[in-house]
Interface confidence: low
Amino acid sequence: ACISNPCNEGSNCDTNPVNGKAICTCPSGYTGPACSQDVDECALGANPCEHAGKCLNTLGSFECQCLQGYTGPRCEIDVNECISNPCQNDATCLDQIGEFQCICMPGYEGVYCEINTDECASSPCLHNGHCMDKINEFQCQCPKGFNGHLCQYDVDECASTPCKNGAKCLDGPNTYTCVCTEGYTGTHCEVDIDECDPDPCHYGSCKDGVATFTCLCQPGYTGHHCE
């Protein structure tokens, strides 16, 4: 019975010893008495394609059309989207289904962490300090008389005790003022005021003191000014 080759190409033909008829043993993907009918693998129940891939029947077999993010004959392989190192600036790449996500290092943003965040955008420097944008930080160049990370501190110009002779120091922005005690003058109250100038003693010689003077009177004169 096999002489006439009734079985489809690729199948094995055997003769039934009882009735002498041909028995066709079908290869995978074919069925029927002559193995001429294609098996629709996509209609057998369970989808042979994993991860929701689309099954396409072909002659004697099937193909899987995979969703984005999967590959392989049965869509069994999860594509690692991070293999191409898409994330920049030392960012962490998360391999997600069909895409990647970049977790940026501080100071960067954007889909690929490609944008260096402008930390000066919020004008963080006080008292007209100049902001310099750095990676993940900013630096304030402070005007004279101010310091601190944000130029927030008024420098205490009185810290060096510039005022002399018991004077009081008043701190101001980038300056200080000395309030002198009686009898002293000058920027730092360093000058003892000469109370003998002009000469207050009418008939005598003048002796200067601190905020005062003394008249040494000539014989025959008296009074505070030898008057």
Epitope: Q68, T92, L94, Q96, E99, I103, E109, V111
Partner: antibody, heavy 115, light 110 residues
Framework: EVQLLESGGGLVQPGGSLRLSCAAS????????MSWVRQAPGKGLEWVSS????????YYADSVKGRFTISRDNSKNTLYLQMNSLRAEDTAVYYC????????WGQGTLVTVSS | QSALTQPASVSGSPGQSITISCTGT?????????VSWYQQHPGKAPKLMIY???NRPSGVSNRFSGSKSGNTASLTISGLQAEDEADYYC?????????FGGGTKLTVLG
Amino acid sequence: EVQLLESGGGLVQPGGSLRLSCAASGFTFSNYGMSWVRQAPGKGLEWVSSISGYGSNTYYADSVKGRFTISRDNSKNTLYLQMNSLRAEDTAVYYCARISQQAVWGQGTLVTVSS
Amino acid sequence: QSALTQPASVSGSPGQSITISCTGTSSDIGGYQYVSWYQQHPGKAPKLMIYYVSNRPSGVSNRFSGSKSGNTASLTISGLQAEDEADYYCQSADSSSWVFGGGTKLTVLG
């Protein structure tokens, strides 16, 4: 100004459906994955669903899988959440959120599931 | 997708410092630098206070700081003020979603 504005909330019976919308403005919408986060009355925040920038990938919390569908229309700068087979436990304020370094959240829309 | 663990409530007096912990696993907090903290006042949307573990968005007071050790993240608020009274939520990435903590109610005493 970067803004998200939700709409579509309301009262619905158990088993019913509702579609939430979120209008985005002030940023390049397609550059960002977007999410829905909900908050039941007196409870904490619960992540519901996320979608990638071009809509090719979606993610769902187990509690809503198979019932909710997230989608987006980048030409309209709008995010959607289609909610089917609603249950009483889905009652919550639903927030549309851009969860990123510069996070942006909407003010929320209340969904009440009750007979 | 199980929630991160936070204490239900913490309290402190004005001027004091408090710390709120947030415990996860190696799949979320331990696996990524992505930990955020949100502040939420009643009836309002959450406001981002800390991102990437320890970074403050512009406009957030430097009294707020964040840190992470292993699978636990922490939010510290120094110099407590009355307006800090609110709910605080931690949030982390896991492999394909976002996960939140259960929330901590901060009460400022007095």
